[in-house]
Every structure is written in structure tokens, then in C-alpha cells.
């Protein structure tokens, strides 16, 4: 997960945009990525970076937990 997120974040050379990506990785079981992104007011660049990283992180976590279930862990 960390490697994949770092790969995405490396595209963003504006520090705030990069941090928007990292914010998207934080776990939040109560809201979807879209719901969280809707509260961002600093600009579309931040929304895009946040959403991309949030969705990727969610997918990777879901895949990992699915693998864990398959392995009976």
C-alpha cells in the first residue's frame, strides 16, 4: 500500500497537493472517498489527488482483507 501511494504521490510536486493525496489514505470507515472529498475547499487539484489516493488505498485494503479471508487468517 505504501509503495503504491508513494508512486502516486510522487506525481504531485506541489506540497499541498501531495499532502491531499496522503490525507486520502487515512482510514475512515464512516464515509466514502467521495463524501470526504466533497468537503475539500482548497481546489480541484486537491480533490483529484485526494480521491485518487483514497480510492487506490481502499481498493488495496479490500484486496488484502479478501486475500486474508481466502487464506483463513
Amino acid at each position: 500500500l505504501q509503495e503504491k501511494i508513494e508512486e502516486i504521490a510522487a506525481k504531485y510536486k506541489h506540497l499541498v497537493v501531495k499532502k491531499c493525496c496522503y490525507d486520502g489514505v487515512r482510514i475512515n470507515h464512516d464515509e466514502t472517498c467521495e463524501q470526504r472529498a466533497a468537503r475539500i475547499s482548497v481546489g480541484p487539484r486537491c480533490v483529484k489527488a485526494f480521491t485518487e489516493c483514497c480510492v487506490v488505498a481502499s481498493q488495496l485494503r479490500a484486496n488484502n482483507s479478501h486475500k486474508d479471508l481466502q487464506l483463513g487468517r
Partner: antibody
Framework: QVQLVQSGAEVKKPGSSVKVSCKAS????????IHWMRQAPGQGLEWMGY????????NYNENFKGRVTITADKSTSTAYMELSSLRSEDTAVYYC???????????WGQGTTVTVSS | DIVLTQSPASLAVSPGQRATITCKAS??????????MNWYQQKPGQPPKLLIY???NLDSGVPARFSGSGSGTDFTLTINPVEAEDTANYYC?????????FGGGTKVEIK
């Protein structure tokens, strides 16, 4: 309407520090990044750094080698730029500006003249 | 850091004529089809004023005689026709990455 109002002119001795303020009004202060630029007499614009007041995130121009500190007071919608170890080459007009959409500077302060002289 | 090279450093134009200023970036300021290049006008004793954002978008209230074009590394600000009040310094600026950088400026004088 959006306004950025800066503090008044300063005259400082070499080696001292200066702190310039930038009071924002007419918009939600925490929604936009505030940048600081400077312009030496007869010269172009030099970017110094910025702060995102909502999160407190900052980034600085490495040319200033740790001499610059940018802070923000959300309660008064004011950003500050402090420059230490002043030298004569720091004599300039210092500007704050709002960055819209992480893309461009749409509003600027009126500028603060800082003169460094012994 | 992205270095922005403006040319010419100065130019004198007659009223009614066209003024063209170029800005060359040391690397592309295009990201996913969006060009993070802006243009500002600065008159003596005043702060800079936004003219053009995202390479070609005119800021509100800016006269239509100002236009911007270009993509990637090569950008142009055009004033056509030039008016007496356009006497000023003009700067390009990139916001793709930190540190934000400005071109060295172009001084436009009216003959």
C-alpha cells in the same frame, strides 16, 4: 470583497528580524493558501513560501536557508512572515498573495517595504 | 526548480500595435492536460495583477486585448492593440510545482 491588508513599512538593523502581517477579509481564510513573495528595488519577483491555514502546512524556498518562518492565526484571519538574520540584500517590498485553486495568485496585499540598514 | 526565461527583457511599442512576450520553461508545466502557467502585470508602486491563468484564460475584468497561448514549455502573452495604460512590467509564473517561480519580467513601454 476579498482584501489582503499588510502591516506598515519597517526599518531594521542587519542581524535583526522582521515580522510582516497580512490580514485577510472577504473570504473564508482557511480555504486558500497564502504565499509570500518579495521584490528587491528594480528587480523581479521572488517566491518565499506559503502556508495552508486550515492544516498549518508550510513550504519554503530553500534559498532562504531556514531564515523564513510563515505562520497563520485562524482566529484573526492573519498570516505572518518572519525573516531573521537580516542583511542589506533583504531590503525589498514583501507581498502576500492568495492562491486560488492551487493554480494562480488572484489577490495580492499592497506590499510592505522593509529596509535593512545600519 | 523550474526556470522561466522571459524575452525580450524590454520592448517599446506604438499605440495600436501588437506586443508579444514569450516565456520558456526549463521543463513542462503541463500536468494531465492542464498548463500551470500564469501572467501578471505590475505597474510602478503597485502589487502584481493577474491577467491570464492556466496559459490562456483571461481573468475577470481584464480587457480582451490581452491573450495568452502556449503549452508544455513555450508560452506567449499578446497585447493587441497596445494602449498607453499598458505601460508596465509583465511576469510569467508557474504553479505546477514548488518552488513556485517567476520569469525575470518584461518591461513594456509605449512609444
Amino acid at each position: 470583497q476579498v482584501q489582503l491588508v499588510q502591516s506598515g513599512a519597517e526599518v531594521k538593523k542587519p542581524g535583526s528580524s522582521v515580522k510582516v502581517s497580512c490580514k485577510a477579509s472577504g473570504y473564508t481564510f482557511t480555504d486558500h493558501i497564502i504565499h509570500w513573495m518579495r521584490q528587491a528595488p528594480g528587480q523581479g519577483l521572488e517566491w518565499m513560501g506559503y502556508i495552508y491555514p486550515r492544516e498549518g502546512w508550510t513550504n519554503y524556498n530553500e534559498n532562504f536557508k531556514g531564515r523564513v518562518t510563515i505562520t497563520a492565526d485562524k482566529s484573526t484571519s492573519t498570516a505572518y512572515m518572519e525573516l531573521s538574520s537580516l542583511r542589506s540584500e533583504d531590503t525589498a517590498v514583501y507581498y502576500c498573495a492568495r492562491e486560488r485553486n492551487l493554480e494562480y495568485f488572484d489577490y495580492w496585499g499592497q506590499g510592505t517595504t522593509v529596509t535593512v540598514s545600519s | 526548480d523550474i526556470v522561466l526565461t522571459q524575452s525580450p527583457a524590454s520592448l517599446a511599442v506604438s499605440p495600436g500595435q501588437r506586443a508579444t512576450i514569450t516565456c520558456k520553461a526549463s521543463q513542462s508545466v503541463d500536468f494531465e492536460g492542464f498548463n500551470y502557467m500564469n501572467w501578471y502585470q505590475q505597474k510602478p508602486g503597485q502589487p502584481p495583477k493577474l491577467l491570464i491563468y492556466a496559459a490562456s484564460n483571461l481573468d475577470s475584468g481584464v480587457p480582451a486585448r490581452f491573450s495568452g497561448s502556449g503549452s508544455g514549455t513555450d508560452f506567449t502573452l499578446t497585447i493587441n492593440p497596445v494602449e498607453a495604460e499598458d505601460t508596465a512590467n509583465y511576469y510569467c509564473q508557474q504553479s505546477l510545482e514548488d518552488p513556485h517561480t517567476f520569469g525575470g519580467g518584461t518591461k513594456v513601454e509605449i512609444k
